[in-house]
């Protein structure tokens, strides 16, 4: 789980060990702050749980791509 040491900086210290079904992911944000020990992605699920994931893992990249496509406004 993400940990806010001194708000507003949120850091991840551990990553999830298991892939999360992409259909259960609602949104994500990248953690790139130099105040954090590692770069991370925090996914928010449809039931509002927040999960730290490793941005180097393919499933994390695929999930971000999927969410990006979902949120793109259709061109008219």
């Amino acid at each position: 789980q993400p940990d806010a040491i001194n708000a507003p900086v949120t850091c991840c210290y551990n990553f999830t060990n298991r892939k999360i079904s992409v259909q259960r992911l609602a949104s994500y944000r990248r953690i790139t702050s130099s105040k954090c020990p590692k770069e991370a992605v925090i996914f928010k699920t449809i039931v509002a749980k927040e999960i730290c994931a490793d941005p180097k893992q393919k499933w994390v990249q695929d999930s971000m791509d999927h969410l990006d496509k979902q949120t793109q406004t259709p061109k008219t």
Epitope: R18, K19, S21, T45, I46, V47
Partner: antibody
Framework: QVQLVQSGAEVKKPGASVKVSCKVS????????MHWVRQAPGKGLEWMGG????????IYAQKFQDRVTMTEDTSTDTAYMELSSLRSEDTAVYYC????????????WGQGTLVTVSS | DIVLTQSPDSLAVCLGERATINCKSS????????????LVWYQQRPGQPPKLLIY???TRESGVPDRFSGSGSGTDFTLTISSLQAEDVAVYYC?????????FGQGTKVEIK
């Protein structure tokens, strides 16, 4: 394509334990979330528990919490469900079921393992 | 926990006739931002594991005949078999995968009249 193959039928005495296995092929176990569902004779489907990646832990139905243990051997891609303190009402077919990365629902089921509890 | 209640418990329908099964959820299983209902329908024939028919409440699994259709949203869902065939004799279950614990309806047995 994921395939799940379960261990064979078991007959147990009341008070004993049973351990059912579920071997995964076509994917590695760590890519999946394994769940267990049982069905007593002539009854409906009952979710017993499974791995919840959102909590990064195995969660159990309240009804089975104190009697069931679900484990995994990632070296052999095999999941296990152990049920202890068996009673006659535990006579049922036990299924493993899983979903892959692109689905949140159980799209793959094992063939089922009949566990009979009888003195 | 989300409770799913199916109706009827059993149903006898003539060959070629329509069969309709309802599933009511105690809480909404709709995730409104993507308009997806986290509900599936399974068919279970005697001695076999459940077979996935419908996911996202209305999307047919590949290979499932088009006489099977799912509809509904939020808390009320329906599985329809438009023209019952002999091989459709089975028990049908709805299941939600919106929030844990995952729960099933009690099942609806479909027979030929």
């Amino acid at each position: 394509q994921v395939q799940l193959v379960q261990s064979g039928a078991e007959v147990k005495k009341p008070g004993a334990s049973v351990k059912v296995s579920c071997k995964v092929s076509g994917h590695t176990l760590t890519e999946l979330s394994m769940h267990w569902v049982r069905q007593a004779p002539g009854k409906g489907l009952e979710w017993m528990g499974g791995f919840d990646p959102e909590d990064d832990e195995t969660i159990y139905a309240q009804k089975f919490q104190d009697r069931v243990t679900m484990t995994e051997d990632t070296s052999t891609d095999t999941a296990y469900m152990e049920l202890s303190s068996l009673r006659s009402e535990d006579t049922a077919v036990y299924y493993c079921a899983t979903n892959d990365f692109w689905s949140g629902y159980f799209d793959c089921w094992g063939q089922g393992t009949l566990v009979t509890v009888s003195s | 926990d989300i409770v799913l209640t199916q109706s009827p418990d059993s149903l006898a329908v003539c060959l070629g006739e329509r069969a309709t099964i309802n599933c009511k959820s105690s809480q909404s299983v709709l995730y409104s931002p993507n308009n997806k209902n986290f509900l599936v329908w399974y068919q279970q024939r005697p001695g076999q594991p459940p077979k996935l028919l419908i996911y996202w409440a209305s999307t047919r699994e590949s290979g499932v005949p088009d006489r099977f259709s799912g509809s509904g949203s939020g808390t009320d869902f329906t599985l329809t078999i438009s023209s019952l065939q002999a091989e459709d004799v089975a028990v049908y279950y709805c299941q939600q995968y919106y929030s844990s614990p995952w729960t099933f309806g009690q099942g609806t047995k479909v027979e030929i009249k």
